[in-house]
Interface confidence: low
């Protein structure tokens, strides 16, 4: 063999024994009849040698190191050549090393032609035996950026101050090109930037510098991911350790497309973003470590790029073109642990503008899609106003309070659908008639349906909540004096299946003075629980409500109050209750602030319960709970 190195080439060739094998027969380099085990050839030298055995590859390795000095003169940028050519070298396992030294202000970029590189961890090896070991430099300290195989996603690595690249080729490998080029860049102001390019679906495992040892103190390392727009990327941390910080905090920062809060900063222990569309950056920032007990910062993570999951590539049409005074908001559900980050979850309009909240308004048709790993993290809130400005036009008019089918077909759970029902003051009132009779939610008989109607006053100054009502009870209708909001609130995904049970009609009726009237038609053998509005806060001052309770001809109703006294203490006025038989008009009047509440009473005919409040003293509110039970009229209880 003959190796001749040109003058000024800054190349050194070293042939030395490799890892010792248990081969019985030793092997030597033979030069001028001398038997040696190591040979060094420098620039300008020409040496002829041979080996004393037939399979020198089992004994020796060759290292070819080229020093590139960018400090004193111009850098030889461009495609890097294998020098000397592999055809001139003995067939030994060979390592080509390029050691580039540059000023701190100079950025150096290694560009890898296809196939790109795949980073491997400690203990891993490359299938074809070809490995790329890349190191950087911080002052005099060498920092290992990583070891890489072929057939990956890493296309470029940018560093500053210097780079050492070692390409290891097995003796049998035919490769005769370096596969990379060097370019100069402006200062990157960090340890390194690794660019990872995905052409299609795939994954990449990447590691912090020096992994599995500690990341250099107070350093910054960035990974840039290039992802086709039609694919989605998710990041998961496979392994990490935190050091003991004296100043600053160790963290990762993301530049995420569509995020209004770039950079997004997370702790390493947080859940990392998922389902990101398009290119994004991830940076690892170290801290100033405790000198006595520094610990180590290290990170191994995976980026998974795949086609959009589930709903992400579906377009949904939300047709609000025939709606008026309506807005639909899709937004994140409130999460308990606000410090924990969860993967990105976006809703997109026309598949282009994506955000975590989206409000659609009536009068248009909207095309939306979702960019979210888990759609249960979103919900919908809808508001619709039905107002009557002219009582002559509205009286006796009816509107169906039904969730439009377009909304039910969306893959996001409906949380609230609120109808604001507005009437001209002192001119009209409202009546709500459900498709299925309603049950009032009480502690004694809670609703267990997938949705309820929450009925409350919509007059800003009035704090009046009539209650929560669900299908399957005895309340036939609810009449209210003035503006109210009716909110259909869902409690379970099964609402989709039970949606047919929803159905409430509102009609504008002549004005009446009572705050509310509940029409109750109890079913036989079921106990109906009823309670005054504003339960737990007390019926508002000077408010009057009534219950119109029907008793079938062959039944008797038992009216039971659940307290001995109402508990109300009046500041001004009187609180009273009237129980009036509808047939005979006979009535009993009870002073709620003085009398005990009536014992259970039996009613053979339909009757009224009317409760009117005084102005109570604070803390002594009027809250009443009562029940009505029907039993067959077998004996004459009078």
């Amino acid at each position: 063999f003959e190796i001749a190195l040109p003058r000024e080439s800054n190349i050194t060739v070293l042939i030395k024994l490799g890892t010792p094998t248990l081969l019985a027969k030793p092997c030597y380099i033979v030069i001028s009849k001398r038997h040696i085990t190591m040979l060094s050839i420098k620039s300008g030298e020409r040496i002829v040698f041979t080996f004393s055995c037939q399979s020198p590859e089992n004994h020796f390795v060759i290292e070819i190191q080229k020093n590139i000095d960018c400090m004193s003169g111009p850098c030889p940028f461009g495609e890097v050549q294998l020098q000397p050519s592999t055809s001139l070298l003995p067939t030994l396992n060979r390592t080509f090393i390029w050691d580039v030294k540059a000023h701190k202000s100079i950025g150096l970029e290694l560009q890898f032609s296809i196939p790109r590189l795949r980073q491997i961890g400690p203990g891993e090896s490359c299938p074809d035996g070809v490995t790329h070991s890349i190191s950087g430099r911080i002052d005099a300290t060498v920092v290992r950026i990583g070891t890489f195989c072929s057939n990956g996603t890493v296309s470029r690595i940018k560093m500053q101050e210097g780079v050492k690249m070692a390409l290891h080729l097995p003796w049998f490998h035919p490769r005769n090109v370096s596969g990379f080029s060097i370019a100069n860049r402006s200062s990157i102001k960090r340890l390194c930037i690794i660019e990872s390019v995905f052409e299609g679906e795939g994954s990449a495992t990447l590691m912090s510098a020096n992994y599995p040892e500690g990341f250099p103190e107070d350093e910054l390392m960035t990974w840039q991911f290039v992802v086709p727009a039609h694919l989605r990327a998710s990041v998961s941390f496979l392994n990490f350790n935190l050091s003991n910080c004296e100043r600053k905090e160790e963290r990762v920062e993301y530049y995420i497309p569509g995020s209004t809060t770039n950079p997004e900063v997370f702790k390493l222990e947080d859940k990392q973003p998922g389902n990101m569309a398009g290119n994004f950056n991830l940076s690892l920032q170290g801290c100033d470590q405790d000198a006595q007990s520094p610990g180590i910062l290290r990170l191994q993570f995976q980026v998974l790029v795949q086609h959009p999951q589930n709903e992400s590539n579906k377009i949904y049409v939300v047709d609000l073109s025939n709606e008026r005074a309506m807005s639909l908001t899709i937004e994140p559900r409130p999460v308990k642990q606000s410090r924990k980050f969860v993967p990105g979850c976006f809703v997109c309009l026309e598949s282009r503008t994506c955000s975590s909240n989206l409000t659609l308004t009536s009068g248009s048709k909207h095309k939306i899609s979702f960019l979210c790993d888990d759609l249960t993290r979103l919900w919908m809130n809808v508001e619709k106003t039905i107002s009557c400005t002219d009582h002559r036009y509205c009286q006796r008019k009816s509107y169906s309070l039904q969730v439009p089918s377009d909304i039910l077909h969306l893959p996001v759970e409906l949380h609230d659908f609120s109808w604001k029902l507005l009437v001209p003051k002192d001119r009209l009132s409202l009546v709500l008639v459900p498709a299925q009779k309603l049950q009032q939610h009480t502690h004694e008989k809670p609703c267990n349906t997938s949705f309820s109607y929450l009925v409350a006053s919509a007059i800003p100054s009035q704090d009046l909540y009539f209650g929560s009502f669900c299908p399957g009870g005895s309340i036939k209708q609810i009449q209210v004096k003035q503006n109210i909001s009716v909110t259909l609130r869902t409690f379970a995904p099964s609402f989709q299946q039970e949606a047919s049970r929803q159905g409430l009609t509102v009609s504008f009726i002549p004005y009446f003075k009572e705050e509310g009237v509940f029409t109750v038609t109890p079913d036989t053998k079921s106990k109906v629980y009823l309670r005054t509005p504003n339960w737990d806060r007390g019926l508002p001052s000077l408010t009057s409500v009534s219950w119109n309770i029907s008793v079938p001809r062959d039944q008797v109703a038992c009216l039971t109050f659940f307290k001995e006294r109402s508990g109300v203490v009046c500041q001004t006025g009187r609180a009273f209750m009237i129980i009036q038989e509808q047939r005979t008009r006979a009535e009993e009047i009870f002073s709620l602030d003085e009398d005990v509440l009536p014992k259970p009473s039996f009613h053979h005919h339909s009757f009224w319960v009317n409760i009117s409040n005084c102005s109570p003293t604070s803390g002594k509110q009027l809250d009443l709970l009562f029940s009505v039970t029907l039993t067959p009229r077998t004996v004459d209880l009078t």
């Epitope: 377009i315 049409v317 048709k365 089918s405 039910l408 299946q497 047919s500």
Partner: antibody, heavy 119, light 107 residues
Framework: QVQLQQSGSELKKPGESVKLSCKAS????????MHWVRQAPGQGLKWMGW????????TYADDFKGRFVFSLDTSVSMAYLQISSLKSEDTAVYYC????????????WGQGTLVTVSS | EIVLTQSPATLSLSPGERATLSCRAS??????LHWYQQKSGQSPRLLIK???QSISGIPARFSGSGSGSDFTLTISSVEPEDFAVYYC?????????FGQGTKLEIK
Amino acid sequence: QVQLQQSGSELKKPGESVKLSCKASGYTLTDFSMHWVRQAPGQGLKWMGWINTETGAPTYADDFKGRFVFSLDTSVSMAYLQISSLKSEDTAVYYCSRGRDYDPHFDYWGQGTLVTVSS
Amino acid sequence: EIVLTQSPATLSLSPGERATLSCRASQSISDFLHWYQQKSGQSPRLLIKYASQSISGIPARFSGSGSGSDFTLTISSVEPEDFAVYYCQSAHSFPYTFGQGTKLEIK
């Protein structure tokens, strides 16, 4: 390949009922909405409504509320159209058609079922 | 509801000629308009979606244009198999409606 196979022609008397079927194959029924379209003899196409194949919720056009019912049996990938109290003006070809991702254009159609109502 | 008016009701052309079919909506429907072809005794077939988007498997001689309330279906050079009835369909809001159709017949 995607196919919508509809049941055969029906001859009915006024006042009777009929149930038409549409079998979906080559795709998962619940991934796409199913629409029904009517075409009276020598006339144009009239959209009757659609059924959400995931939830089973039907939506009817105003002219088809009352006597027309859309239903599904997802276990056998079938969609059905039932018409009760048939009238002579119900004589038409009834098509089932697949809606793309709730996006109302119909990329696949059944071959149609002719319903003739005559005394 | 959206009313779609197609014109002409009948279009008589010879093979090789250019066909221009019009569809006008009673109000602006953006690009929510689709075109279908129906041959005698057959089911309709989707030709163009969203006014101008081509459909896989449909010959390139079929193209659509328009937005708002005026739409056009163009057949650049009519082939013998193109003689059929063509319907436009609005997908803007419930109920979805079809035009009354344009019959393309051999001259």
